[in-house]
Interface confidence: low
């Protein structure tokens, strides 16, 4: 970068090389060429000359002032006009950043998803930073009161098989940058309440032929957890608004969960799952369509096949891949 | 501590249209739903939409079209806005914290004060 | 729009007596109910989700019960600072929408 070149003088940031966005700063420049009384004093910020603003303070020195300073990095560099030179000599160099302290992180979640071996704890920076920000995850055993420290810049994972000190812990989360340090509230953790279980999974529809036709929802997970409650919520295509429906379930065998829906509608479902009684849902699955028969054939459909549809007896729709859903009810 | 306050401007002409401004403290709105919701003696407590995480809104179909609903998440401030005022919309307005993330189904767990409007000439 | 019909609108107890208010739904909302107290000039609190849920911080005395489109709320032995008004509100679908609100009085 620019701080790596050799310099014949010295750049300086008043009030620092890192500071806070929006802040007035003055960026020094002071001259110590051999042979040379410079003329003119230059600034540039990011190989662009600066025209105004720029102060003569002595022989050797200049003042370059900015107000309201708002880019989050910048390489600054300033040159001499020596007399007898034909081209500007470089003084020196320096790289700037302005940014934000951090917010208090806030929102600090910890949960294991099941067959993971990790524990996974998040939470919310706040506003961004711009600037290198660390954060320090403490987790302290509520047990034999030791605590263990891990360095992340966003989330971090922890091996449950570190986590020795019983099934009880303390969970804070510092962060801290140049401009400042915050601390978390301490959250709370019992490893066995805050397991997700192994992902739901919508793996075909079909439509059968009655007086009422009924579509029927095959879905599964690989959980070994035994006390499950799950979301299926669906919604026509065209719709905004959600239906949902709850059960509690038992993944020994294939589930399978009846609708009474309107007839030659494209429709969208998805599930997911929590331990019963605990606090940690399961991302919704990926979107599953299924389009619902003109009149009473029987309609088997596939995952976001886009618009598969017959007009005969079968619409195959096994599902495949992962579609991006809207997770606002990840974990919470 | 999560708090809420709405700014709104107390007295609003006849067919002219509401602004009310609710600031959010100690939670991101990246994270949380806004919901809104009145109050007037005549009418008890109206839901009367939500701004989710996401920036998508859920509006109460009788007043879908003369009400928006924007925010700043950097700012923590969500925008209300509602065209057309009667004087049967004269009430406290209140912007409201869905408690956590279960789509369409989260109890309201932190208020703002209210702000109180009157629709006059 | 699912009505929420909330009984009575007014009611009369001692302090330390049990009260019961009823709230409604015109259809079936599962368990999808809260409810809430206002005090006057203030804005409401959450007492009660998932029409049986005791939220953060409100004393035991508060209870709900209930599902389908049937729900009760129960104040067990009335505080003073109990004597102000209660909503119910169904969570079920949009609109969401409140009970009329039932105003506890002072015998």
């Known amino acids: 970068g620019i701080t790596n070149i050799n310099c014949s003088g010295h750049i300086w940031v008043e009030p620092a090389t890192i500071f806070k966005m929006g802040m007035n700063i003055s960026i020094y420049c002071q001259a110590a060429i051999k042979n040379c009384q410079p003329r003119k004093l230059h600034f540039y910020k990011n190989g662009i000359k600066e025209r105004f603003q720029i102060t003569r303070i002595n022989k050797t020195t200049a003042r370059l002032w900015y107000k309201n300073f708002l880019e989050p990095h910048a390489s600054m560099y300033c040159t001499a006009e020596c007399p007898k030179h034909f081209q500007e000599t470089l003084i020196c160099g320096k790289d700037i950043s302005s940014g934000y302290p951090p917010d208090i992180p806030d929102e600090v979640t910890c949960v294991i998803y099941e067959y993971s071996g990790n524990m996974t704890c998040t939470w919310n920076a706040g506003k961004l930073t711009y600037i290198d920000t660390k954060y320090v995850v403490h987790v302290k055993s509520l047990e034999t009161e030791e605590e263990q420290q891990y360095l992340t810049s966003s989330y971090i994972n922890i091996s449950t098989d570190s986590l020795q000190g019983g099934k009880k812990y303390l969970v804070w989360v510092q962060a801290a940058n140049a401009l400042g340090m915050e601390e978390s509230k301490q959250l709370q953790i019992h490893l066995d309440d805050i397991v997700i279980p192994s992902a739901a999974v919508i793996s075909r529809a079909e439509t059968i032929n009655a007086t009422v036709p009924k579509t029927i929802i095959y879905w599964d997970s690989q959980t070994t957890i035994e006390k499950v409650s799950c979301e299926m919520r669906y919604k026509a295509t065209t719709n905004q608004t959600w239906n949902v429906k709850e059960f509690d379930t038992n993944f020994t065998y294939v589930q399978q969960s009846e609708f009474y829906l309107e007839p030659n509608i494209k429709y969208v479902f998805q599930v997911r799952c929590q331990e019963t009684g605990k606090r940690y849902w399961q991302p919704w699955s990926s979107l599953f369509f299924h389009k619902t028969p003109e009149t009473v054939p029987q309609v088997t459909s596939k995952a976001f096949q886009h618009d598969t549809w017959n007009s005969g007896l079968t619409v195959a729709s096994i599902s495949t891949g992962h579609l991006t859903s809207d997770n606002r009810g990840d974990i919470g | 501590d999560v708090q809420l306050q709405e700014s709104g401007p107390g007295l609003v002409a006849p067919s002219q249209s509401l602004s009310i401004t609710c600031t959010v403290s100690?939670?991101?709105?990246?994270?949380?739903?806004v919901h809104w919701v009145r109050q007037s003696p005549g009418k008890g407590l109206e839901w009367l939409g939500v701004?989710?995480?996401?920036?998508?809104?859920d509006y109460n179909a009788a007043f879908i079209s003369r009400l928006s609903f924007s925010k700043d998440n950097s700012k923590r401030q969500v925008f209300f806005k509602m065209n057309s005022l009667q004087p049967d919309d004269t009430a406290i307005y209140y912007c409201?914290?869905?408690?956590?993330?279960?789509?369409?189904?989260?109890?309201?767990?932190?208020w703002g004060q209210g702000t109180t409007v009157t629709v006059s000439s | 729009d699912i009505q929420m019909t909330q009984s009575p609108a007014s009611q009369s107890a001692s302090l330390g007596e049990s009260v019961t208010i009823t709230c409604l739904a015109s259809?079936?909302?599962?368990?999808?109910l809260a409810w809430y107290q206002q005090k006057p000039g203030k804005s409401p609190q959450l007492l009660i989700y998932?029409?049986?849920s005791l939220a953060d911080g409100v004393p035991s005395r508060f209870s709900g019960s209930g599902s389908g489109t049937k729900f009760s709320f129960k104040i067990s032995s009335l505080q003073a600072e109990d004597f102000v008004s209660y909503y119910c509100?169904?969570?079920?679908?949009?609109?969401?929408?409140f009970g009329g609100g039932t105003k506890l009085e002072i015998k």
């Open positions: 100690g939670f991101s709105l990246t994270n949380y739903d």
């Open positions: 998932a029409a049986t």
């Open positions: 701004i989710w995480s996401d920036g998508s809104t």
């Open positions: 259809q079936t909302i599962g368990s999808w």
């Open positions: 509100q169904q969570l079920y679908s949009s609109p969401l929408t």
């Open positions: 409201a914290r869905n408690n956590y993330y279960r789509y369409g189904r989260n109890p309201m767990d932190y």
